[in-house]
């Protein structure tokens, strides 16, 4: 059943969607598999805090501990990755803060992507000292499990030495790894003893074994790659926005709604209004009016600007954002003060000046 009555028909018209919204990305907390993660809910004056993951209620279990404003995840796994939210319920309102958890290893196995120190791994031996292959930098091989978000680049390294200089080849799940086994193939940098796969996809999951050998012996090392799929999600609105604002009669004010959405968002600014002297319809639902929405003939829909305000403009303003997956909304109040008789220009107080450009 609808939660409000619209004053006018707001069937959404065709829109022009030229922009991709990647605004106000939620804070990201990164943990390696097996590590523990602790996050504090960054909301003030929280009487009761509830937690969700990917829109589903999160309760305590043997690995998840909820103590006051803290969320603890023990022995994190890639499945703990996702969009988390804490909601602070107060006596008069509630507020939600979103953050991402990414349980993943770094891009490369133990060093930076640019391989600046790679030349050190290429060890030259005295030609008289024949030697079977050996690892030259085991620290770069310690992390065997690599949980990587889809579309990222993965690099596995097996720095080795030996005399004569060993050769390196790679296996996937125990079989020869061929270029045609994945779209885009892969790169092998022999000088850096590395395998590089760009834009990984779920089918890249598996065990990758480097085999390093010369005529005196052979050694191998196996990495496990897990590709964490991302999936589309409903819009996220930056906590605390729009912010409450106040101004004098005749002043100007702006409300800002910061949106993060993978899919194209439809933004609406809605206000509670009166119709025939009543704030509520016959069904008991409040009357709402759409003041602005994204699409044709609409400038930056994330900002609602009110000019030369009157006392009638006071009230609650709702930023409502929808994509094809779901919805999110947050609201703010506008207080309109009587115009002071003092000489000189009134100073208007705008919402969230930090976010205005």
């Amino acid at each position: 059943r609808p939660s409000f009555s619209l004053v006018e028909d707001t069937t959404l018209e065709p829109e022009e969607p030229p922009t991709k919204y990647q605004i106000s990305q939620p804070e990201v907390y990164v943990a390696a598999p097996g590590e523990s993660l602790e996050v504090r809910c960054l909301l003030k004056d929280a009487a009761v805090i509830s937690w969700t993951k990917d829109g589903v209620h999160l309760g305590p279990n043997n690995r998840t501990v909820l103590i006051g404003e803290y969320l603890q995840i023990k022995g994190a796994t890639p499945r703990d990755s996702g969009l988390y939210a804490c909601t602070a319920s107060r006596t008069v309102d509630s507020e939600t803060w979103y953050f991402m958890v990414n349980v993943t290893d770094a891009i490369s196995s133990g060093d930076d992507e640019d391989d600046t120190d790679g030349a050190e791994d290429f060890v030259s031996e005295n030609s008289n000292n024949k030697r079977a292959p050996y690892w030259t930098n085991t620290e770069k091989m310690e992390k065997r499990l690599h949980a990587v978000p889809a579309a990222n680049t993965v690099k596995f390294r097996c720095p080795a030495g030996g005399n004569p200089m060993p050769t390196m080849r790679w296996l996937k799940n125990g079989k020869e790894f061929k270029q045609e086994h994945r779209i885009g193939g892969y790169k092998v940098r022999n000088q850096h003893w590395s395998l590089i796969m760009e834009s990984v996809v779920p089918s890249d999951k598996g065990n990758y074994t480097c085999v390093v050998e010369n005529e005196y012996g052979s050694i191998n090392h196996t990495y496990h790659l897990d590709v964490v799929e991302r999936s589309p999600h409903r819009p996220i609105l930056q906590a605390g926005l729009p912010a409450n604002a106040s101004t004098v009669v005749g002043g100007d004010v702006e409300f800002v709604c910061k949106v993060y959405s993978d899919a194209q968002p439809h933004i609406q600014w809605i206000k509670h209004v009166e119709k025939n002297g009543s704030k509520y319809g016959p069904d008991g639902l409040p009357y709402l009016k759409v003041l602005k929405h994204s699409g044709i003939n609409s400038s930056n829909a994330e900002v609602l600007a009110l000019f030369n305000v009157t006392e009638a403009d006071a009230g609650e303003y709702i930023c409502k954002v929808s994509n094809y997956i779901g919805q999110a909304n947050q609201s703010a109040w506008l207080t309109v003060l009587p115009k002071q008789q003092a000489p000189g220009r009134e100073k208007e107080i705008t919402a969230s000046p930090d976010y205005l450009e």
């Epitope: 409000f4 959404l12 065709p14 969607p17 030229p18 409903r234 899919a263 919805q327």
Partner: antibody, heavy 113, light 106 residues
Framework: EVQLHQSGTVLARPGASVKMSCKTS????????MHWIKQRPGQGLEWIGA????????NYNQKFKGKAKLTAVTSASTAYMDLSSLTNEDSAVYYC??????WGQGTTLTVSS | QIVLTQSPAIMSASPGEKVTMTCSAS?????MSWYQQKPGSSPRLLIY???NLASGVPVRFSGSGSGTSYSLTISRMEAEDAATYYC?????????FGGGTKLEIK
């Protein structure tokens, strides 16, 4: 496991009305739009509209306004679509889908006198 | 409304062959989705947000494009890929689908 289960095949007379259902399980029903799609025999796909169960918001394709009525019962995690004043043009398979990656198996509607 | 035009309407390919089909939009879009449908079955999501592979979809499928021009590529055709493919936009109301490309096996 996410599942969307739609009601079975319907045979109706011209001028009549029908109601089909889409029962969901395995995900938070209220958090996602439920879209309805029409596919005429041997034809392509048409978006009818969508309902957001959490608050009852509905968006219709203008073409189907007055023809389709979408509702949802959150306690049963089920979405419904009513089709009225049926004609032969309404004979089709109707799908419910959420997020684009969860689909029902389809309800076949045949309108015939 | 945004009209999506798919081409070709019908095509055939031999096993192992590379297949590319296109979808042209009447207005610029942010993203495109692609579906596969076989007779008697529901559509199956292959690609979302233009280039993201949906869960469980073989890596031989890929999507690309921007603005008004998008494409779906199958790197190596397999017999099980014979189906009708639809592009769809979730950017602008009313959401619309292309007319479909029917892919047959030679």
């Amino acid at each position: 496991e996410v599942q969307l289960h739609q009601s079975g095949t319907v045979l109706a007379r011209p001028g009549a009305s029908v109601k089909m259902s889409c029962k969901t399980s395995g995900y938070t029903f209220t958090n996602y739009w439920m879209h309805w799609i029409k596919q005429r025999p041997g034809q392509g796909l048409e978006w009818i509209g969508a309902i957001y169960p959490e608050n009852g918001d509905i968006n219709y394709n203008q073409k189907f306004k007055g023809k389709a009525k979408l509702t949802a019962v959150t306690s049963a995690s089920t979405a419904y679509m009513d089709l009225s004043s049926l004609t032969n043009e309404d004979s089709a398979v109707y799908y419910c889908t959420s997020r684009g990656d969860y689909w029902g198996q389809g309800t076949t509607l045949t309108v015939s006198s | 409304q945004i009209v999506l035009t798919q081409s070709p309407a019908i095509m055939s390919a031999s096993p192992g062959e590379k297949v590319t089909m296109t979808c042209s939009a009447s207005s610029g879009l942010s993203y495109m989705s692609w579906y596969q449908q076989k007779p008697g079955s529901s559509p199956r999501l292959l690609i979302y947000d233009t280039s993201n592979l949906a869960s469980g979809v073989p890596v031989r499928f890929s999507g690309s494009g921007s603005g008004t021009s998008y494409s779906l590529t199958i790197s190596r055709m397999e017999a099980e890929d014979a189906a009708t493919y639809y592009c769809q936009q979730w950017s602008s109301y009313p959401y619309t689908f292309g007319g479909g490309t029917k892919l047959e096996i030679k």
